[in-house]
Interface confidence: low
C-alpha cells in the first residue's frame, strides 16, 4: 500500500503533439500534484519507445543530460527549483523523430509516474502553379501544373474551373525523407476559347489555416480567327465613306493584315489601312467579295465578305458610318 495521505499524483500531457519538419517543437509534460499532497521529484526522464537508454534526463543535483545536446532542451526545469515541469523542446525536427515518447517523473514517495506522447512530424508543403503553354492539338494535354512540394502528409490538390478539364495527380517521395511531392496536371483539349482564361489550383493540407488557392492564366497558341465587321447590307450610292474592320483573335498577336478581293487586288474605291478598309463613295452599283487575310506566327487565316452598293435613297435604312 502507498503511505498514508498519498493521493493521485498524475502526469499530464497531450496524447499527440504535432511538429513541423525542420522546426522546433515542445513536448509538454507536467506533474499534477493534488493540493494536500507532498511529493519530491528527483529526476525527470525522457525515453523513446523502441530505443535503449534515455534521451534526456534532468537530475536533481547534476542538471540536464542529453543524448543529442544540440537538439534537446528542458524548457522549464532548473537546478534548485521544484521539478514539476518536464516539458522538452526538440530542435530541427526530422521525419525519424516521429514516434512514441515516454515522459517519466521519479518521485518520492509515490514512485515513478509516466505518460506516453505521440509526436507527429508534419511538413508544410511549398506550392507552385504554372501554365503549360500549348498549341491546338485536338487531344487532351496538360495545360496547367500544380506542385505541392515536400508535404507530410501529402497535400490534397483539386482544380476549380468552369472549363471542364480532368486532373491527373501523382505523388513522388519528397527530397526530405518522409515527405511527399504531389503534382497535379490539369488536362484539357486546347481551344482558342480557353486562351487567357483562369483555372484555380486548390491545395489543402493540415498545416494550413485555410486552403491555398493558386490561379493559373491559361495560354493557348492558335492561328488567327478572322471575321469582317462594319457592313449592314444597306449601302447605297451617294453615301459617305464607310469603314470595314478585320476582326482577328489570335495568340500570338497578328503580325499582318492583307486586304484583297476574289478577283485579285483591291478596286480603287477600297483603301487598306491595316486592319481597316476604307470604302470611298462610288457612283455606280458594285457587288464585290472582299477578303481579309491575317497572319501570325502560327499561320494565316482569312475571312470573306460580299459587299453590295445599291441604287436607291440613303434614307433611314443607312447603316454606313457617316463622317
Amino acid at each position: 500500500w502507498p503511505p498514508p495521505g498519498t493521493g493521485d499524483v498524475v502526469v499530464q500531457a497531450p496524447t499527440q503533439v504535432p511538429g513541423f519538419l525542420g522546426d522546433s517543437v515542445t513536448l509538454p509534460c507536467y506533474l499534477q500534484v493534488p493540493n494536500m499532497e507532498v511529493t519530491h521529484v528527483s529526476q525527470l526522464t525522457w525515453a523513446r519507445h523502441g530505443e535503449s537508454g534515455s534521451m534526456a534526463v534532468f537530475h536533481q543535483t547534476q542538471g540536464p543530460s542529453y543524448s543529442e545536446s544540440k537538439r534537446l532542451e528542458f524548457v522549464a526545469a532548473r537546478l534548485g527549483a521544484e521539478l514539476r515541469n518536464a516539458s522538452l523542446r526538440m530542435f530541427g525536427l526530422r521525419v525519424e523523430d516521429e514516434g512514441n515518447y515516454t515522459c517519466l517523473f521519479v518521485t518520492f514517495p509515490q514512485g515513478s509516474r509516466s505518460v506516453d506522447i505521440w509526436l507527429r512530424v508534419l511538413a508544410k508543403p511549398q506550392n507552385t502553379a504554372e501554365v503549360q503553354k500549348v498549341q491546338l492539338t485536338g487531344e487532351p494535354v496538360p495545360m496547367a501544373r500544380c506542385v505541392s512540394t515536400g508535404g507530410r502528409p501529402p497535400a490534397q490538390i483539386t482544380w476549380h474551373s468552369d472549363l471542364g478539364g480532368m486532373p491527373n495527380t501523382s505523388q513522388v517521395p519528397g527530397f526530405l525523407s518522409g515527405t511527399v511531392t504531389v503534382t497535379s496536371l490539369w488536362i484539357l483539349v486546347p481551344s482558342s476559347q480557353v486562351d487567357g482564361k483562369n483555372v484555380t489550383c486548390k491545395v489543402e493540407h493540415e498545416s494550413f489555416e485555410k486552403p491555398q488557392l493558386l490561379t493559373v492564366n491559361l495560354t493557348v497558341y492558335y492561328p488567327p480567327e478572322v471575321s469582317i465587321s462594319g457592313y449592314d447590307n444597306n449601302w447605297y450610292l451617294g453615301q459617305n465613306e464607310a469603314t470595314l474592320t478585320c476582326d482577328a483573335r489570335s495568340n500570338p498577336e497578328p503580325t499582318g493584315y492583307n486586304w484583297s478581293t476574289t478577283m485579285g487586288p483591291l478596286p480603287p474605291f477600297a483603301v487598306a489601312q491595316g486592319a481597316q478598309l476604307l470604302i470611298r463613295p462610288v457612283d455606280k452599283p458594285i457587288n464585290t467579295t472582299l477578303i481579309c487575310n491575317v497572319t501570325n506566327a502560327l499561320g494565316a487565316r482569312q475571312a470573306e465578305l460580299t459587299v453590295q452598293v445599291k441604287e436607291g435613297p440613303p434614307s433611314e435604312h443607312s447603316g454606313i458610318s457617316r463622317n
Epitope: 525542420g22 506542385v147 501523382s170 513522388v172 517521395p173 527530397f175 526530405l176 511531392t181 496536371l185
Partner: antibody, heavy 116, light 107 residues
Framework: EVQLVQSGSELKKPGASVKVSCKTS????????MHWVRQPHGKGLEWIGG????????SYNQRFKGRVTITVDKSTSTAYMELSSLRSEDTAVYYC?????????WGQGTLVTVSS | DIQMTQSPSAMSASVGDRVTITCKAS??????VAWYQQKPGQPPKALIY???YRYSGVPDRFSGSGSGTDFTLTISSLQAEDLAEYFC?????????FGQGTKLEIK
C-alpha cells in the same frame, strides 16, 4: 531565365580534392533542391547527391558517402560539390541540376580530370 | 538500387523513320520516369516527365509511354536534329538512377 553556371575545368592528382561551384539565377534558390550528377566520358549519368538550400539537409548516393560534401551559400545562390580522395575513375563531367522530380535545368558541366 | 536497363545501346535510323527506345526498371517505379536528350558537348535536356508528358517546347514527334517497369520513348518521324544520346531516369526512390543511354545516329 533560369541559369546554372558552373566553374571551369579542373586537373587534379590522385588523392586530392576538388570543389565545383554552381551559381544560379532566374529563380528563388531556396525553393528548389539542387543535385549533382556526373558523367564519365562516353558513359552514362550517375547521381551523386543533393541538398535542400533552406535547411541544408543533404542526401548522398552511398557510393560517394564519406567522399562527397554538398553545400550551399544562400547569399550568392550558389551550390558546391566537393569530392575528396580523388582517383582516376572520378574523371568525368560533373553537372549541377535543379530538381523538380526530374531534373529540369542543368549546368553546362565541369570537366574534372584526375591524372598523375 | 533500382536498375534502369535501356535498349538498344546504339541504333541508326533514317530521317522520317519511327524510332523506339525502351527502358526497363528492376522494380516498380510507377510513372516516375523522365527521358532526356543529350547532344554532343551539351548537358542533358529534359524531354518527358511522369513517363508520358512532354515538356513545353518539346516537339510533338517525341512521346513517352509506360508505367511500372516498362517504359518507351518514341520519335514518330525522325529529324536530322534528333541525332543525340537519350537517357531514361527513375525518380521513385534514392539513389536516383539513369539508363546507360541510347546513342541515336542518322543513316
Amino acid at each position: 531565365e533560369v541559369q546554372l553556371v558552373q566553374s571551369g575545368s579542373e586537373l587534379k592528382k590522385p588523392g586530392a580534392s576538388v570543389k565545383v561551384s554552381c551559381k544560379t539565377s532566374g529563380y528563388t534558390f531556396t525553393e528548389y533542391t539542387m543535385h549533382w550528377v556526373r558523367q564519365p566520358h562516353g558513359k552514362g549519368l550517375e547521381w551523386i547527391g543533393g541538398i535542400h538550400p533552406n535547411q541544408g539537409e543533404t542526401s548522398y548516393n552511398q557510393r560517394f558517402k564519406g567522399r562527397v560534401t554538398i553545400t550551399v551559400d544562400k547569399s550568392t545562390s550558389t551550390a558546391y560539390m566537393e569530392l575528396s580522395s580523388l582517383r582516376s575513375e572520378d574523371t568525368a563531367v560533373y553537372y549541377c541540376a535543379r530538381w523538380t522530380g526530374d531534373f529540369d535545368y542543368w549546368g553546362q558541366g565541369t570537366l574534372v580530370t584526375v591524372s598523375s | 538500387d533500382i536498375q534502369m536497363t535501356q535498349s538498344p545501346s546504339a541504333m541508326s535510323a533514317s530521317v522520317g523513320d519511327r524510332v523506339t527506345i525502351t527502358c526497363k526498371a528492376s522494380q516498380n517505379v510507377g510513372t516516375n520516369v523522365a527521358w532526356y536528350q543529350q547532344k554532343p558537348g551539351q548537358p542533358p535536356k529534359a524531354l518527358i516527365y511522369s513517363a508520358s508528358y512532354r515538356y513545353s517546347g518539346v516537339p510533338d514527334r517525341f512521346s513517352g509511354s509506360g508505367s511500372g517497369t516498362d517504359f518507351t520513348l518514341t520519335i514518330s518521324s525522325l529529324q536530322a536534329e534528333d541525332l543525340a544520346e537519350y537517357f531514361c531516369q527513375q525518380y521513385q526512390s534514392y539513389p536516383y538512377t539513369f539508363g546507360q543511354g541510347t546513342k541515336l545516329e542518322i543513316k
